[in-house]
């Protein structure tokens, strides 16, 4: 422990100027004090001043009050510091003297004299707090007042409690009343030296070294580290473990950058015609009447669509087209005959059926025959009947639709599973993807389909962490992790939460 | 909470004496840690220090107003007095009453409103 | 007699520090108070002991002593710190008050 005694002398009274023994001081008493502090006694007795001693220069004569703060060692108030645990008792003796000599020294006088002494024996506890009191005697009085802090750094009631405020790498904190310590803004834990981070800082994915920091650790981001990085090319995903890429709607592939809703990101389909998706960056476009080409961006002649019937013959004009009728018929379309069954009109060994008492007809066409007359060829691939690209084929009373790879079925509705061709070679395991199939090869082969047998095993060095399985054969030299539930990355070097959704790309 | 309060005349004759009182209440007078003073301030001048006195009747005084000033003591009535003698229109000022505490290193840490006291014929 | 010296006036933008001097002979021997006084009402008690706050005054008041001068410091100033203000030490046994100092 460590503390001052301090005691403040405040006014002294010695009008008749007299010594304890009677006498009187010539000119005046030339007044200084010894005090001597020592430990508790309940009767006090000569002896060692076991809690320090000291003494003023003169004072004053006579009677006078105190009030400078006298250089050297007469500072009011007197300082006894001692060096141990403060008991919360004392005795002290405060004697007032006369010397003839040194103002400044008068303990080292011959011929001091005793003027008066008090005895002050009691308890006192550590504070900031004065203990004013007064004593009297026959001839002096002695106002004064005493109390005991601690030093520097110490604390506690009886100052044995060591706290030193500190700004550092050990600690951030100032001293409280007790010794305690109190937390400078921005730090906790038991010494002050643990930065408080960023308010909302995420507690696992973020950490910092000074107060309100948030810095990320890998596979985080953001202000508060609570957004997870995605895998590194992931386009069009996202995730919710690091590494991840979990597409958006309309996207495939390992990185989300395959195109699985070209139509509705494209609108690729021009003039009010409809788009259907066929895979990634396929689509088709059916085209409404009086439109062609692969977008439908091509408009058709509006005789294209043979609107004059009887043989009649279509001219284009403005916006519309006109019908030029042959003998016999007549009306927009050249629909209304003047002819009757008597004139053989019917074409292509249609049958003629007399109507209105005779006065017109219509013709009954055989099979694979129509227009009014049976002068058309029937042609069944004017309804688009083709689904997913197929290109339609008459084939005399019928017709087929010859699909695009990967569809079947007679209008070529069904898709087709590209593994189920079995395209990987040497038992490399096949996946069906939306653009086409992806082959994991087994060890010591590559390419597409596993065709090609190499000599470097790319997982021979064993890449993969964690118990993950290699495999090689994407691509010449490459390797897949297939990873075990609980790890990702392309060496399944991340633990997670959870399984990855396909084996990562090496 | 310690209140001082001066009271007496606000106008008094040039070579006539000032007397003033101050009241102490909230408090006792007769306390060791206090001296109990008076100083004042001329109108729009600084502050001058007059003198103070203990419970027990020790005085001490401005040297520069030493032969003019008595300051006393009533511990029964809880008051303290100033009189200054041969005043002059040097003399007009605001009178404080303090109260020193010695515990403060004699800081004044209690002071009445003061009382303005105009010396003219 | 001994004599305290004060500057007349301070001038000081709010926010910034106030520095008040106030010099007399080994004044760094003596305890120096100070007072704050505003217009039409009795000084207030704001340092004691050279550089102790008494209970109630902000801690943006501070004081030093040694030398010759002792200094008041009013840091992070506020416009309701503008007034006069008094230094006052004890030379044996009379008390002596500086000229005073208006800070504005």
């Known amino acids: 422990g460590s503390g001052i005694f301090q005691l403040r002398l405040q006014e002294f009274v010695n009008q008749r100027g007299m010594l304890a023994n009677g006498q009187s001081c010539e000119p005046g008493c030339r007044t200084f004090f010894r005090i001597c502090l020592k430990h508790f006694q309940a009767t006090f007795s000569e002896g060692p001043c076991t809690f320090g001693n000291v003494s003023t220069p003169v004072l004053g004569t006579n009677s006078f009050v105190v009030r400078d703060k006298n250089s050297g060692s007469g500072r009011n108030p007197l300082q006894l510091p001692f060096n141990f645990t403060w008991p919360g008792t004392f005795s002290l003796n405060i004697q007032a003297w006369h010397t003839p000599g040194d103002d400044l020294r008068p303990e080292t006088s011959p011929g001091n004299s005793l003027i008066s002494q008090i005895i002050i024996q009691g308890s006192l506890a550590v504070g900031k707090i004065w203990r004013t009191d007064e004593q009297n005697d026959t001839l002096t009085r002695l106002s004064y007042s005493y109390r005991v802090i601690c030093s520097d750094n110490y604390y506690g009631e009886s100052c044995s409690r060591l706290c030193k405020k500190r700004d550092d790498h050990f600690g951030h904190y100032e001293c409280q009343p007790d010794g305690s310590l109190s937390c400078l803004p921005g730090w906790t834990g038991k010494y002050c030296d643990q930065p408080i981070c960023l308010s909302g800082c995420h507690e696992q994915n973020g950490y910092c070294s000074k107060p309100d920091e948030c810095i990320c650790r890998p596979g985080w981001q953001g202000r508060l580290c609570n957004e997870c990085i995605p895998h590194n090319g992931c386009r069009h995903g996202t995730c919710s473990i690091p590494w991840q890429c979990a597409c958006d709607e309309g996207w495939g592939g390992l990185f989300c950058d395959q195109d699985l809703n070209y139509c509705t990101h494209h609108s690729p389909c021009k003039n009010g015609s409809t788009c259907s998706n066929s895979g990634p960056k396929g689509y088709t476009c059916t085209c409404l009447p009086g439109y062609t080409g692969e977008h439908c961006e091509l408009g058709l002649s509006k005789c294209a669509s043979n609107p004059c019937r009887n043989g009649g013959s279509c001219k284009d004009q403005e916006n519309s087209y006109h019908c030029l009728c042959p003998p016999g018929y007549y009306g927009q379309h050249c629909e209304h005959s003047t002819l009757t069954c008597a004139d053989s009109p019917c074409f292509n060994g249609g049958s003629c059926r007399e109507r209105n008492q005779g006065s017109s007809y219509a013709c009954e066409c055989p099979p694979n025959f129509t227009g009014s007359n049976c002068e058309k060829k029937v042609d069944r691939c004017t309804s688009n009947p083709c689904a997913n690209g197929g290109q339609c084929q008459n084939r005399g009373p019928s017709r087929t639709c010859r699909c695009r790879p990967g569809f079947t079925g007679t209008h070529c509705e069904l898709h087709i599973s590209d593994c189920a061709r079995s395209p990987c070679a040497h038992g490399g395991t096949c996946h069906d993807l939306e653009n086409g199939p992806v082959c994991t090869c087994p060890a010591g082969f590559s390419g597409r389909r596993c065709e090609v047998r190499i000599t470097h095993d790319a997982c021979a060095s064993g890449p993969c962490f964690n118990g993950a399985t290699c495999y090689t054969g994407l691509s010449p030299n490459n390797f897949v992790c297939n990873c075990p539930y609980g790890f990702v990355g392309s060496r399944c070097e991340f633990p997670v939460g959870l399984p990855p959704s396909f084996p990562w790309v090496a | 909470e310690v209140q001082l309060q001066e009271s007496g005349p606000g106008l008094v004759k040039p070579s006539e004496t000032l007397s003033l009182t101050c009241t102490v209440s909230?408090?006792?007078?007769?306390?060791?840690?206090?001296?109990w003073g008076w100083i004042r301030q001329p109108p729009g001048k600084g502050l001058e220090w007059i003198g103070d006195i203990y419970y027990a009747g020790s005085t001490y005084y401005n040297p520069s107003l030493k032969d003019r000033v008595t300051i006393s003591v009533d511990t029964s009535k809880n008051q303290f007095s100033l009189k200054l003698s041969s005043v002059t229109a040097a003399d007009t000022a605001v009178y404080y009453c303090?109260?020193?505490?010695?515990?403060?290193?004699?800081?004044?840490?209690?002071w009445g409103q003061g009382t303005l006291v105009t010396v003219s014929s | 007699s001994y004599e305290l010296t004060q500057p007349p006036s301070v001038s000081v933008s709010p926010g910034q520090t106030a520095s008040i001097t106030c010099s007399g002979d080994?004044?760094?021997?003596?305890?120096v108070s100070w007072y704050q006084q505003k217009p039409g009402q009795s000084p207030v008690l704001v340092i004691y002991?050279?550089?102790e706050r008494p209970s109630g005054i902000p801690e943006r008041f501070s004081g030093s002593n040694s030398g010759d001068t002792a200094t008041l410091t009013i840091s992070g100033t506020q416009a309701m710190d503008e007034a006069d203000y008094y230094c006052?030490?004890?030379?044996?046994?009379?008390?002596?008050f500086g000229s005073g100092t208006k800070v504005t």
């Open positions: 006052q030490a004890w030379d044996s046994e009379a008390g002596v």
């Open positions: 909230g408090g006792s007078i007769s306390s060791s840690s206090y001296y």
């Open positions: 080994r004044l760094g021997d003596k305890y």
């Open positions: 002991e050279d550089s």
């Open positions: 303090a109260r020193e505490d010695m515990i403060l290193g004699g800081g004044a840490d209690n």
